[in-house]
Amino acid sequence: SIPWNLERITPPRYRADEYQPPDGGSLVEVYLLDTSIQSDHREIEGRVMVTDFENVPEEDGTRFHRQASKCDSHGTHLAGVVSGRDAGVAKGASMRSLRVLNCQGKGTVSGTLIGLEFIRKSQLVQPVGPLVVLLPLAGGYSRVLNAACQRLARAGVVLVTAAGNFRDDACLYSPASAPEVITVGATNAQDQPVTLGTLGTNFGRCVDLFAPGEDIIGASSDCSTCFVSQSGTSQAAAHVAGIAAMMLSAEPELTLAELRQRLIHFSAKDVINEAWFPEDQRVLTPNLVAALPPSTHGAGWQLFCRTVWSAHSGPTRMATAVARCAPDEELLSCSSFSRSGKRRGERMEAQGGKLVCRAHNAFGGEGVYAIARCCLLPQANCSVHTAPPAEASMGTRVHCHQQGHVLTGCSSHWEVEDLGTHKPPVLRPRGQPNQCVGHREASIHASCCHAPGLECKVKEHGIPAPQEQVTVACEEGWTLTGCSALPGTSHVLGAYAVDNTCVVRSRDVSTTGSTSEGAVTAVAICCRSRHLAQASQELQ
């Protein structure tokens, strides 16, 4: 019967006794940077070409015996997971292997850098179809390795990496921390984070998504017909590399940004038990398990968005945090979050010709996060409209006044430390959905976009009594672009988007009196693109 991991990534409509997805990734080449491999294993023979690239350190220890099957173990298994003819994800994909890990699974930053350069040169000499590079390795944070990944990604290569097996923040490791790389954590058959001895999968904001990574059956280098179970974020990354190969084979023109958004969109949502993660990492870690799209074509009509969290600002009074979208993405909204609730809001600002989301810490605060909502919106023209503090009793307001521009997000930023502590909430006047409303002492920022066929609407959900969390979701066919809290609720910790749901978090209700101040309203801006929908119908 079908191995659990292949069943897990397969949409129900393809499920059968055997894993036979419609497109096997035949137009895509996957580069594997790992140990040596047993290329004559019948699972991968003819599918994997061993390049002459080898850059590995000497094995440690005088008593180390170099045994071929042990040297090949990790790479052979991963090659099988990606493209094995029996237990592989992308059965049609061809692979090339580069040896950057020695027989003990150790490598160097320099070896990996030279390997990436080898791939870049190969691509220049003989351009082929879409390329996926699988980096099933993790070391300490390396600015130079991250920069090399960035260069290759900007040359059109999709890089997929393991989050690391240190039960730690993936942002502390490379290449996992490189924003341009698709970073993958590991889950088990119960959709729980993988535990590996006393450690386990890495987590945090640098992880893009999770994938099966425990008890994964794959080719064993022990013998030509041998199979073995292995576990770890390397195996998880191999699944995503396989899924990426299949998506790219179906749609070879996909950009890295489009691919990442699709991987996120088609993932299983909210199935991971977040209690496994440290409390401070739960909100930052994506609750997503990778899956193949239900159809490899026809996803183009959707407006895809993802949430990008910044690094923590740190606790100093004037500390800020910045969240950035990928080059091909549009920043459609910006929000902020602080566990202490002490923050001075957020604003969208231009940096290097691109909008970024900046959050501001407040005096006595433990620090803030900026949260960017990054979307794929072709032919978009977005701008930020700002209204300075109004000092008027009705609060500050700003709207999208340009013809054809719609509101995609609202942000507010203030200079005073105790904004609104004793003020009742300001309610948005009805019938004015294209408007952001805020405290009179706050400057309000409206993200206004024009794009063919783009339409947006505001959805609110208010709870009169104090509640730790208030949510509002966009309905089917609409995508959440903006998430904010209605002003006046001083105990709000912040707002952020989780998939298609806007979450507004408040302080522990036990510390808040049940006054009008306890009212919490979550405001979602939901958008869709009729232009994209029509375009995909024409293609079909």
Partner: antibody
Framework: QVQLVQSGAEVKKPGESLKISCKGS????????ITWVRQMPGKGLEWMGL????????RYSPRFQGQVTISADKSISTAYLQWSSLKASDTAMYYC????????????WGQGTLVTVSS | DIVMTQSPDSLAVSLGERATINCRSS????????????LAWYQQKPGQPPKLLIY???TRESGVPDRFSGSGSGTDFTLTISSLQAEDVAVYYC?????????FGQGTKVEIK
């Protein structure tokens, strides 16, 4: 039920070509390997090679490499063993069998095809 | 190539008696990654194709009578018929299926004494 049905006995002259078949039914043909085994009169079993119909990957025993060709047509769930120029020493019973990646032994066998090469 | 050697070449046993066939491989077919012996036993009766009896050295195929058992590990293996029946008259082959080319033993002919 799961079965492999082989084509009938063949009598050929040396130098002639031949293609014998093995049709699978009752299972997912593309997800199993098909192995060919030779048994010369009064002798033991010799593994010739295999094919994976899913992608037509083949593997031959060095002894049979270049002597025979293994192929498959997954649209009709059939594997083939062929010779371009038969020799008298090719006289034997030929069996096809299936095996799976998780069970790499031959669990189901065809009934065999007797090939006689004689002038 | 892994060479499989069976002994004896032929064996005559009385009905109801135990028959023991040995098989030795030129290199180990036990693999540490899954702790399995990649060895199978087949029975071939006159005019019939081979039939799988035992796989992973000791696991009986469904439908095979429990008088057939396999044992051994690494390089030395044994097929035992605990109480020989008339229908057990056949040639028995061991096979390693771990390395290409896959190889069979030369066969052991079991007859009734």
């Amino acid at each position: 039920q799961v079965q492999l049905v082989q084509s009938g006995a063949e009598v050929k002259k040396p130098g002639e070509s031949l293609k014998i078949s093995c049709k699978g039914s009752g299972y997912s043909f593309t997800n199993y390997y098909i192995t060919w085994v030779r048994q010369m009169p009064g002798k033991g079993l010799e593994w010739m090679g295999l094919i994976y119909p899913g992608d037509s990957y083949t593997r031959y025993s060095p002894r049979f490499q270049g002597q025979v060709t293994i192929s498959a047509d997954k649209s009709i769930s059939t594997a083939y063993l062929q010779w371009s120029s038969l020799k008298a020493s090719d006289t034997a019973m030929y069996y096809c069998a299936r095996d799976h990646w998780s069970r790499p032994y031959s669990d189901v066998w065809g009934q065999g095809t007797l090939v006689t090469v004689s002038s | 190539d892994i060479v499989m050697t069976q002994s004896p070449d032929s064996l005559a046993v009385s009905l109801g008696e135990r028959a023991t066939i040995n098989c030795r491989s030129s290199q180990s077919v036990l693999y540490s990654s899954n702790n399995k012996n990649y060895l199978a036993w087949y029975q071939q009766k006159p005019g019939q194709p081979p039939k799988l009896l035992i796989y992973w050295a000791s696991t009986r195929e469904s439908g095979v009578p429990d008088r057939f058992s396999g044992s051994g590990s690494g390089t030395d293996f044994t097929l035992t018929i605990s109480s020989l029946q008339a229908e057990d008259v056949a040639v028995y082959y061991c096979q390693q299926y771990s390395s290409f080319p896959i190889t069979f033993g030369q066969g052991t002919k079991v007859e009734i004494k």
